[in-house]
């Protein structure tokens, strides 16, 4: 029985050209996390494997950085990055847990203050 729950950063509104962190946290289960996939729509952005570490998809290498933790940092945001992002936790023995985060990327005049900083 799958007892775990995924908590996310929550939906985010960010500024074009800026950076944001997407994070998920799996709680309420003792299942072992074997791999975390980060996806947008049907595109794989990155994989964090418990044994093999991080793999960033070649098409996102310039703009996606691993971490912090099992999270993902998106840099040099464009309006085209607006959309839904998925953290997919592969666990044993529970199976798969999925978290969802919607990111809205706006021109600088309307982006929320909290997401305006650049992450080093």
């Amino acid at each position: 029985m799958m007892t775990g729950t995924i908590e996310t950063t929550g939906n985010i509104s960010a500024e074009k050209g800026g950076s944001i962190i997407l994070q998920c946290h799996l709680s309420s289960t003792t299942a072992q996390v074997t791999q975390v996939n980060w996806e947008q729509q049907d595109q794989l952005l990155a994989i964090c494997n418990a044994d093999l570490g991080w793999h960033i998809s070649p098409s996102f290498k310039d703009r996606v950085a691993p971490g912090p933790g099992l999270g993902l940092t998106l840099q040099s945001l464009t309006v085209n990055d607006t959309g839904e992002y998925f953290c997919i936790y592969h666990t044993y023995p529970d199976g798969t847990y999925t978290g969802r985060i919607f990111l809205e990327v706006l021109e600088s005049s309307v982006a929320e203050h909290g997401a305006r900083f650049q992450i080093p």
Partner: antibody
């Protein structure tokens, strides 16, 4: 003036599919998310999903995945929601609603489209 | 999904009354950047829902200042300071912080 004009009421048979349109005017269509909301049983409001006109990206309430398909035609500034394999449970009023930038709220709503599923 | 609970379900009022509607969520509506996406709507019979308040406490354009929103975390309140006839209808809160967005069950504001 921002306006969202929806297509008229529909009476459809169980098992059929149908498409509701929502024509936007008075603003830059590609600059704002478009949401779809179901009002059933008089008072209950449910978020069906959204579409990003700029890139065609979608997000669905899992309850409506496979039931609703969202698309846009940028050339006519129109959003569409197709409802599939209709049953009596799908009888409701459906609204399109523009997303308020930055705040994940819905600032302008269409007038609603009443859908009745009956044989 | 985040469960949003509104109270009361029904609110009988007299014109001129001050009323409060409560909205509670099953988890915090503050995102990791400290922004809280909680909005309020009025749905009058035969009309479309209309946005009243967004981001907890910001009045949408054209909304009278007798409407005010407050709260944080999981507890939020809509206050109407002096009820007028045009305020009657169903009030809904909506959380937009977590996917999927979810509405409260609604509060019916009606005459005593």
């Amino acid at each position: 003036e921002v306006q969202l004009q929806q297509s008229g009421p529909e009476l459809v048979k169980p098992g059929a599919s149908m498409k509701i349109s929502c024509k936007a005017s008075g603003y830059s269509f590609t600059g704002y998310i478009m949401n779809w909301v179901k009002q059933s049983h008089g008072d209950n409001l449910e978020w069906i999903g959204l579409i990003v006109p700029y890139n065609g990206g979608t997000s669905y309430n899992l309850k409506f995945k496979g039931k609703a398909t969202l698309t846009v035609d940028k050339s006519s500034s129109t959003a569409y929601m197709e409802l599939l394999s209709l049953t009596s449970e799908d009888s409701a009023v459906y609204y399109c609603a523009r997303g308020l930038q930055r705040f994940y709220a819905m600032d302008y709503w269409g007038q609603g489209t009443s859908v009745t599923v009956s044989s | 999904d985040v469960v949003v609970t509104q109270t009361p379900l029904s609110l009988p009022v007299s014109f001129g009354d001050q009323v409060s509607i409560s909205c509670r969520s099953s988890q915090s509506l503050a995102n990791s950047y400290g922004n809280t996406y909680l909005s309020w709507y009025l749905h009058k019979p035969g009309q479309s829902p209309q946005l009243l308040i967004y981001g907890i406490s910001n009045r949408f354009s054209g909304v009278p200042d007798r409407f005010s929103g407050s709260g944080s975390g999981t507890d939020f309140t809509l206050k109407i300071s002096t009820i007028k006839p045009e305020d009657l209808g169903m009030y809904y809160c909506l959380q937009g912080t977590h996917q999927p967005p979810t509405f409260g069950g609604g509060t019916k504001l009606e005459i005593k």
